[in-house]
């Protein structure tokens, strides 16, 4: 079965800078990544990026930048202006369209302790979406 | 490198249906959708409708709404566009064009089929 | 339905000359608005996405600016084989729609 692993990290160096990682483990062709905050995409959550691997990426603040580290998988580089920090206590969702799997979904945050640099585990909470 | 290739022209009766296909090949085709432009003789560019070869959904031009419908076959590539109740006024050639897999965004038109001209005479 | 509006419709210029094509929108299309060429018999052909990008194997002559509703195409040398019509067309909202053309002719 297909599985999205999510990452969430506060950057060492500036402690409002987070960036989310995201793969997909299982055969098939990435046909388009999209990734939100505060809930899956379509169910509360709010668009940051989408990204095509070869159309290329559309993103949205706070998203500074988002990019394919592999075939299949991105980051996505998040600049928090506000001083309260509320990326903390956030719950990012990376949905990748995969064919002929479906649509596969997972959500992370920064575990609630995590010193910075520190990263959440790859342990997915798969939705599974198989549209 | 990547082409569409589109079914020859069509000469039909008003009130006839007609079905074009267009088949895709040099890309991944479930990574892109397919939109169809059509164009009377002598005039510009009128968007028909779009595909997702990703997940079949659609969007049609209001006006072509309950006429027009757009499949793809995965198995082989091709994108279908359908026309039915025709008119003399549907009379162009209708392309298909690559597109994006959702409609929201990257949706430009790169390439282009060669053209179907569609006739509708009595 | 955003309606685009291109200016002028026939643009009269010698091979050489610079060419600046208008395209304006009838709302904000962000910056997600893309040129087409057209040349007779033929298929158009992507110029420009997202109002700046350059296609794949487009000339260097070829350039696109704008964002919100005023957009422009310029060709800064033109060439013989540039002479034709040209298309905008807005990627932003529902439907897509494109502007009515705009024919570079021979002078």
């Known amino acids: 079965t297909p599985e999205v692993w999510v990452q969430v990290q506060m950057e060492a160096t500036e402690l409002s800078s987070f960036t989310v990682h995201c793969g997909f483990l299982g055969p098939g062709s990435i046909s388009l990544v999209t990734v939100s905050w505060g809930g899956p995409d379509g169910a509360g959550g709010t668009k940051l990026a989408v990204l095509h691997p070869e159309l290329g990426t559309r993103q949205w603040a706070p998203a500074r930048q988002a990019r394919w580290e592999t075939q299949s998988s991105i980051s996505l580089a998040l600049e928090d202006s506000g001083a309260s920090s509320p990326f903390a206590n956030t719950t990012f969702c990376c949905k990748f369209a995969s064919f002929p799997e479906g649509s596969w979904e997972s959500c992370g945050s920064l575990p609630p302790s995590s010193d910075p640099g520190l990263s959440a585990p790859p342990t997915p909470v798969p939705i599974l979406r198989a549209d | 490198q990547v082409q569409l290739v589109q079914s020859g022209a069509e000469v039909k009766k008003p009130g006839a249906s007609v079905k074009v296909s267009c088949k895709a090949s040099?890309?991944?085709?479930?990574?892109?959708?397919i939109s169809w432009v059509r164009q009377a003789p002598g005039q510009g560019l009128e968007w028909v409708g779009w595909i997702s070869s990703y997940d079949a959904s659609t969007k049609y031009s209001q006006e072509l709404q309950g006429r027009v419908t757009m499949t793809t076959d995965t198995s082989t590539s091709t994108a279908y566009m359908e026309l039915r109740s025709l008119r003399s006024e549907d009379t162009a050639v209708y392309y298909c064009?690559?597109?994006?897999?959702?409609?929201?965004?990257?949706?430009?038109?790169?390439?282009w089929g060669q053209g179907t001209l569609v006739t509708v005479s009595s | 339905e955003i309606v685009l509006t291109q200016s002028p419709a026939t643009l009269s210029l010698s091979p050489g000359e610079r060419a600046t094509l208008s395209c304006r929108a009838s709302q904000s299309v962000s910056s997600y608005l893309a040129w087409y060429q057209q040349k007779p018999g033929q298929a158009p052909r992507l110029l420009i996405y997202?109002?700046?990008n350059r296609a794949t194997g487009i000339p260097a002559r070829f350039s696109g600016s704008g964002s919100g509703t005023d957009f422009t195409l310029t060709i800064s040398s033109l060439e013989p084989e540039d002479f034709a019509v040209y298309y905008c067309?807005?990627?932003?909202?529902?439907?897509?729609?494109f502007g009515g053309g705009t024919k570079v002719e021979i002078k």
């Open positions: 067309q807005q990627l932003s909202h529902h439907p897509l729609t």
């Open positions: 064009a690559r597109g994006s897999p959702i409609y929201e965004h990257f949706n430009w038109f790169d390439p």
């Open positions: 997202d109002s700046s």
């Open positions: 040099g890309y991944t085709f479930t990574s892109y959708g």
